[in-house]
């Protein structure tokens, strides 16, 4: 299953499959997730080691048993790949690292006014993988405000050095934020020239394209079909690059297919997995296990659950079957692709779904790095769980926020439905940033069921929580994915990095905002909160947040939206925006429904018809 815990001051011994330099443990974990054989990783921060060559070292590891012995190493961080972790799987990495220079091939230098502008330039350059920016206080005046765009053979820095007044980061192309745009078309009977960066076997051109999209240096590809004239080259997928970023030439060639990486697509990237099953096809590879199962779909599920399995073949040969069950061959290879593809066999083959974003319903998100009063504009994909609850009567308007917590579930405040309990009038918009982008053609979700907490009473502050079941499940993308729920009765965690988001008023007597706002607000103890609200009962099922001096808060229109806190690299839904005295007033914190106190209720109500929870808190 999905293991998200990190081990501090621990290093896994042995099992090395690759090593590289990464700026932090989260990026190292992401590289492990996308490496075909990596199950475990260990990372050495600069502070953990004197050896300059090993500083920022990221060590990717495999193990037949799924684990390795841990040795104590001060400062080291170790953990697991996020394969099988559903919507937590993302190649998107937004963080900017201060005081760090990520080295690589510098291919473009320009003057810019901020590190954000430098990151944007990198994201909008087809070859840029990462960048470094010299701030205005950099010691050499001639380098100040320099933005260096970089690449490397593996997509990670060739070295990382601690350097004052330098800030570094990665391209946001994997976040689907590139302005370049992409070529969706595939060209039949056409071969591209230029440099081959890798060669894999794939059953069709679409799998070849997805592999190209997630390969650090692939910009375009040529696929040789299963009827290509040279037998040894059939089903070969050549991943390619060029100096210019586009093919320098193309040749008409029967039974070849060419196309482009989709990494530069805006707003939508293909999933990093291949879910299609290929009947009549055998995938060859190293044998991991053989098991008898009933049906090819069960074979695929078995492969997906066995974390080291990369692909499978389900044999329908009479000698491989007994009763209704047949042999399911679970296989792997060095590069994650079959070592042989054979057609016209009595088998069906496919890939593990361990890297599918939509994966398992029962895990929670770690990713992403009332208007809000005193807030700032959010950016695309920053809060992908935030939804807008809108009512359409004669006109349509935003009324409340909400949080996506599963494919078909939104968590919000019960008071949003005061006087509007009819599910037909509601429209739920997800994956949006600007309310002005909503037109009559913008897709929205309709409500199948509104579940208001049984103890909620109108105009009382208690039990202000409601679940919305959507009529149809939503697919997860970089801009639309769920927030992790806290553990039941979570009281031990001390949250220091909490944010409230919403489109609500920017002042008490204001109006709904166009761009989703965010504000960083500290949590306040319930004792402190009770002192500020002597006319109300602040219960253990509430959580408060706000600045003593006021100025930053949720406000009308933010209700039902999330109060999220980041802990150990993972965002959790700590509160639901509920009530407060005015907005952002001095010594009047906002009051939020404490989600951890309602975990039993949430899990009970979200049981699917087969009795399996649709979402779950971290173990």
């Amino acid at each position: 299953g999905c293991l998200t815990q990190l081990y501090e001051n621990a290093f896994f011994r042995g099992g090395d499959v690759a090593s590289m330099y990464t700026p932090n443990a989260q990026y190292c974990q992401m590289r492990c997730t996308f490496h075909p054989r990596c199950l475990l990783f260990s990372f050495l921060p600069a502070s953990s080691i004197n050896d300059m060559e090993k500083r920022f070292g990221c060590f990717l590891k495999d193990s037949v048993t799924g684990t390795l012995p841990k040795v104590h190493r001060t400062g080291a961080v170790s953990g697991h790949s996020l394969k099988q972790c559903g919507h937590q799987i993302s190649a998107c990495h937004r963080d900017i690292y201060k005081g760090v220079d990520m080295r690589g091939v510098n291919f473009n230098v320009s003057k810019v006014s901020s590190v954000e502008e430098c990151q944007k330039r990198c994201t909008s350059n087809i070859r840029c993988q990462f960048f470094s920016y010299a701030t205005q206080t950099f010691h050499k005046a001639e380098y100040r405000n320099n933005c260096l765009l970089k690449y490397s053979p593996g997509g990670t820095p060739t070295a990382i050095k601690v350097l004052s007044n330098v800030e570094s980061g990665f391209s946001l192309k994997p976040c689907a934020l590139s302005e370049i745009g992409c070529h969706m078309n595939i060209f039949q009977h056409l071969a591209f020239s230029d440099v081959d960066v890798a060669r894999v076997l794939t059953p069709d051109a679409f799998v070849c394209r997805t592999i190209c999209t997630y390969h650090p240096n692939c910009l375009f590809f040529t696929f040789y079909t299963n009827v290509w004239k040279i037998e040894s080259q059939r089903n070969v997928c050549l991943l390619k690059t060029s100096e210019s970023g586009t093919p320098s030439s193309s040749t008409p060639q029967e039974n070849t297919i060419s196309g482009y990486s989709l990494l530069t697509c805006k707003r939508t990237l293909p999933e990093p997995c291949h879910s299609k099953i290929y009947p009549g096809v055998d995938f060859g590879g190293e044998e991991l296990n053989v098991t008898f199962v009933k049906g090819v779909n069960v074979c695929q599920e078995t492969c997906t659950k066995m974390i080291r399995c990369q692909f499978f073949t389900y044999s329908l040969l009479p000698e491989d079957c007994k009763e209704e069950k047949c042999k399911c061959f679970l296989r792997l290879s060095m590069d994650g692709s079959p070592t042989r593809i054979a057609y016209g066999t009595q088998g069906s083959s496919g890939y593990s779904l361990r890297l599918c974003n939509t994966g398992d319903n029962s895990v929670c998100t770690t990713k992403t790095s009332t208007r809000i009063v005193g807030g700032t504009n959010s950016s695309w994909g920053e809060w992908p769980w935030q939804v807008s609850l809108q009512v359409k009567l004669t006109a349509q308007r935003h009324l409340c926020g909400g949080s996506l917590i599963g494919h078909q579930w939104v968590l919000t405040a019960a008071h949003c439905f005061d006087g509007l309990p009819l599910q037909d009038v509601w429209r739920i918009y997800s994956g949006i940033l600007n309310l002005s982008d909503i037109t009559k053609d913008t897709p929205f979700s309709q409500i199948k069921e509104i579940i208001i907490h049984q103890n909620y009473k109108v105009s009382e502050g208690n039990h202000d929580i409601a679940l919305i079941k959507l009529q149809a499940p939503l697919n997860y993308t970089e801009f639309q994915k769920p927030i992790c729920l806290p553990s039941k009765g979570d009281t031990s965690t001390i949250y220091t990095n909490c944010w409230v988001t919403g489109w609500g008023f920017s002042k008490e007597k204001g109006e709904i905002q166009n761009i989703l706002q965010k504000v960083n607000i500290p949590l306040v103890t319930n004792e402190e909160c009770q002192k500020r609200y002597q006319d109300y009962k602040i219960t253990q099922r509430m959580v408060c947040a706000g600045y003593k001096e006021g100025g930053k808060d949720a406000c009308k229109g933010d209700s039902g939206g999330p109060l999220v806190c980041k802990h150990n690299g993972m965002w959790r839904l700590v509160g639901i925006t509920s009530w407060g005295e005015g907005c952002a007033r001095r010594e009047q914190p906002g009051v939020y429904t404490k989600v951890a106190e309602y975990m039993d209720w949430i899990l009970e109500k979200t049981q699917s018809s087969d009795g399996k929870a649709q979402m779950q808190s971290p173990a």
Epitope: M184, N185, I186, Q188, P203, D204, A205, F206, F223, T225, N226, V227, N255, I257, P270, E271, S275, K276, I277, P279, G280, Y343, G344, T345, Q346, T358, N475
Partner: antibody
Framework: EVQLLESGGGLVQPGGSLRLSCAAS????????MMWVRQAPGKGLEWVSS????????SYADSVKGRFTISRDNSKNTLYLQMNSLRAEDTAVYYC????????????WGQGTLVTVSS | DIQMTQSPSSLSASVRDRVTITCRTS??????LNWYYQAPGRAPKLLIF???SLHRGVSSRFSGSGDGTEFTLTISSLQPEDIGTYFC?????????FGQGTKVEIK
């Protein structure tokens, strides 16, 4: 030029049999997955059966399973569909189609042959 | 089996009009979506494969788009020779299934 030419259609009584043929030219027939698709009068398209190049793997729609048999003779560049126990609902134009597995489509189709099952 | 729902079932448009046909699938089919054109009394012909890629010889006035479960075929400028029936097909999961068709006529 890729060409597919069906033959063997006609009028047959319910319970009767018919064998359709599809002669292929203009490509290396022995390398391609082939399929039969049918279209009832005034209706949409329905996949009937598929066969891999070697003939080692065949599959059928539930509606024809156990009654129809797909086969091929790569030396004659010909695809066949043996239809037994025919029913009125099998009345349709039958098309043979080549499959491009590299992009998963039916890139070339024959002109079709009409099968009428009626008493 | 994956269900394919095409809309509209028929449409009438003028020459040079922009025409859009929609195809919805009962589950995510990734990019395994093809479009075919069938002239009256003729065999189907492949227009677009993999959602948006034109088959060789097909006019660039045809284009395809979409993702996951919702797809569209667009004819940017309808021509008299475009009359006939258009079918979508999913090739993601066996059995491959077709939409019920959209009949296009000239006003």
């Amino acid at each position: 030029e890729v060409q597919l030419l069906e033959s063997g259609g006609g009028l047959v009584q319910p319970g009767g049999s018919l064998r359709l043929s599809c002669a292929a030219s203009g490509f290396t027939f022995s390398q391609y997955l082939m399929m039969w698709v049918r279209q009832a009068p005034g209706k949409g398209l329905e996949w009937v059966s598929s066969i891999y190049p070697s003939g080692g793997y065949t599959s059928y729609a539930d509606s024809v399973k156990g009654r129809f048999t797909i086969s091929r003779d790569n030396s004659k560049n010909t695809l066949y569909l043996q239809m037994n126990s025919l029913r009125a609902e099998d009345t349709a134009v039958y098309y043979c189609a080549r499959v491009s597995t590299a992009v998963a489509d039916n890139d070339y189709w024959g002109q079709g042959t009409l099968v009428t099952v009626s008493s | 089996d994956i269900q394919m729902t095409q809309s509209p079932s028929s449409l009438s448009a003028s020459v040079r009009d922009r025409v859009t046909i929609t195809c919805r699938t009962s589950q995510n089919i990734n990019t395994y979506l093809n479009w075919y054109y069938q002239a009256p009394g003729r065999a189907p012909k492949l227009l677009i494969f993999g959602v948006s890629s034109l088959h060789r010889g097909v006019s660039s006035r045809f284009s395809g788009s979409g993702d996951g479960t919702e797809f569209t075929l667009t004819i940017s400028s309808l021509q008299p020779e475009d009359i006939g029936t258009y079918f979508c097909q999913q090739s993601y999961s066996s059995p491959w299934t077709f939409g019920q068709g959209t009949k296009v006529e000239i006003k």
